[in-house]
């Protein structure tokens, strides 16, 4: 069961909670009673587990990836899992912790000496088989910024958004991935109707910037479902 999968090992000597927004006295918010910690790929908290549901890797933290917690598990149940360390098995780059990438099913170090050709070959490998993930859904493929001395500028080849400079994200462009601008208010965005649908995009857009969400443009509410235009809008 999900509970036993996620809650089977207790973690002792937890690190202090990560900095996060705690509630202020008198507000309708209280501080989180537990913070997520990885135990292999099992989640624990100070008092109990708090699975964080996701549909794609980008919804998880930089040290996490999105997948079903059990092999062959319900595709509708996907949570953020702790990234895999060096020499651990993997099926895609996002499963490996920053500083590593997935090569031949194993997380390996992405040191400074890799040739660009090998990086691009890895990207092509990843997208050549869209069903090489744990749950049959394609995922955004990522690689650590350690690969480059500087953050990628717009148009640079990348494998994860942290490869790119501030204000850019790593998105698919034909069969590789490049740094593209994070979307601004009013720009057209892609709202994925079903999980995994981003795997079909040859020209992937970035997500909307902070403070924005991808919503149907006001004057397009009457349009048919397939032709609805989504733009980045403030709340």
């Amino acid at each position: 069961t999900l509970n036993s999968v996620l809650n089977s090992n207790a973690i002792k000597n937890l690190p202090p909670p990560l900095g996060g927004a705690a509630g202020h006295p008198g507000s309708a918010v209280s501080a989180a009673p537990g913070i997520l910690y990885p135990g292999g790929n099992k989640y624990q908290t100070i008092d109990n587990y708090q699975p964080y549901p996701c549909a794609e890797d980008e919804e998880c933290g930089t040290d996490e990836y999105c997948a079903s917690p059990t092999r062959g598990g319900d595709a509708g149940v996907q949570i953020c899992l702790a990234c895999r360390k060096r020499r651990k098995r993997c099926m895609r780059h996002a499963m490996c912790c920053p500083g590593n990438y997935c090569k031949n099913g194993i997380c390996v170090s992405s040191d400074q000496n890799h040739f660009r050709g090998e990086i691009e070959e890895t990207i092509t490998e990843s997208f050549g088989n869209d069903h090489s993930t744990l749950d049959g859904y394609s995922r955004r493929t990522t690689l650590s910024s350690k690969m480059y001395h500087t953050k990628g500028q717009e148009g640079s080849v990348c494998l994860r958004s942290s490869d790119c400079a501030s204000g850019l994200c790593c998105a698919r462009h034909f069969w590789s991935k490049i740094c593209k601008p994070v979307l601004k208010e009013g720009q057209v965005c892609t709202k994925h109707r079903r999980k995994g649908s981003h795997g079909l995009e040859i020209f992937q857009r970035c997500y909307c910037g902070e403070g924005l969400s991808c919503r149907i443009q006001k004057d397009h509410h009457q349009a048919s479902n397939s032709s609805r235009l989504h733009t980045c809008q403030r709340h």
Epitope: G20, A22, A32, G34, Y52, C54, A55, E64, S162
Partner: nanobody, 125 residues
């Protein structure tokens, strides 16, 4: 800052249904995963259900699977918990939580940062 206010709690008989709502104020509600947790007297707060920002992924505690349904309406900044076939052991204070995750914000861990004050649900036998 996201503020969460739960409503819909009350006293019901075993086998009855109840629907909880959690209204969120603040920006970017739709970029947060949302969860429901509960705490019975003398017990630790426990996870009940959660839903991803897009609604594409939901996860439930084994104890409520098949009886409870979590959903969200991003246009209304609201998350819901439909509770059917309630049992006395479902009696607890139910809390809504917002999860601030995502590489977008540079967090190393997706986590629940914001919590409501809770709404009491009492199921009598």
């Amino acid at each position: 800052q996201v503020q969460l206010v739960e409503s819909g709690g009350g006293v019901v008989q075993a086998g009855d249904s109840l629907s909880l709502s959690c209204a969120a104020s603040g920006r970017t509600f739709s970029s947060y995963a949302m969860g429901w947790f509960r705490q019975a007297p003398g017990k630790e707060r426990e996870f009940v259900a959660a839903i991803s920002w897009s609604g594409g992924s939901t996860v439930y505690a084994d104890s409520v699977k098949g009886r409870f349904t979590i959903s969200r309406d991003n246009a209304k900044n609201t998350v819901y918990l439909q509770m059917n076939s309630l049992k006395p052991e479902d009696t607890a204070v139910y809390y809504c939580a917002a999860g601030n995750g995502g590489r977008t914000y540079g967090h190393s861990r997706a986590r629940y940062d914001y919590w409501g004050q809770g709404t009491q649900v009492t199921v009598s036998s």
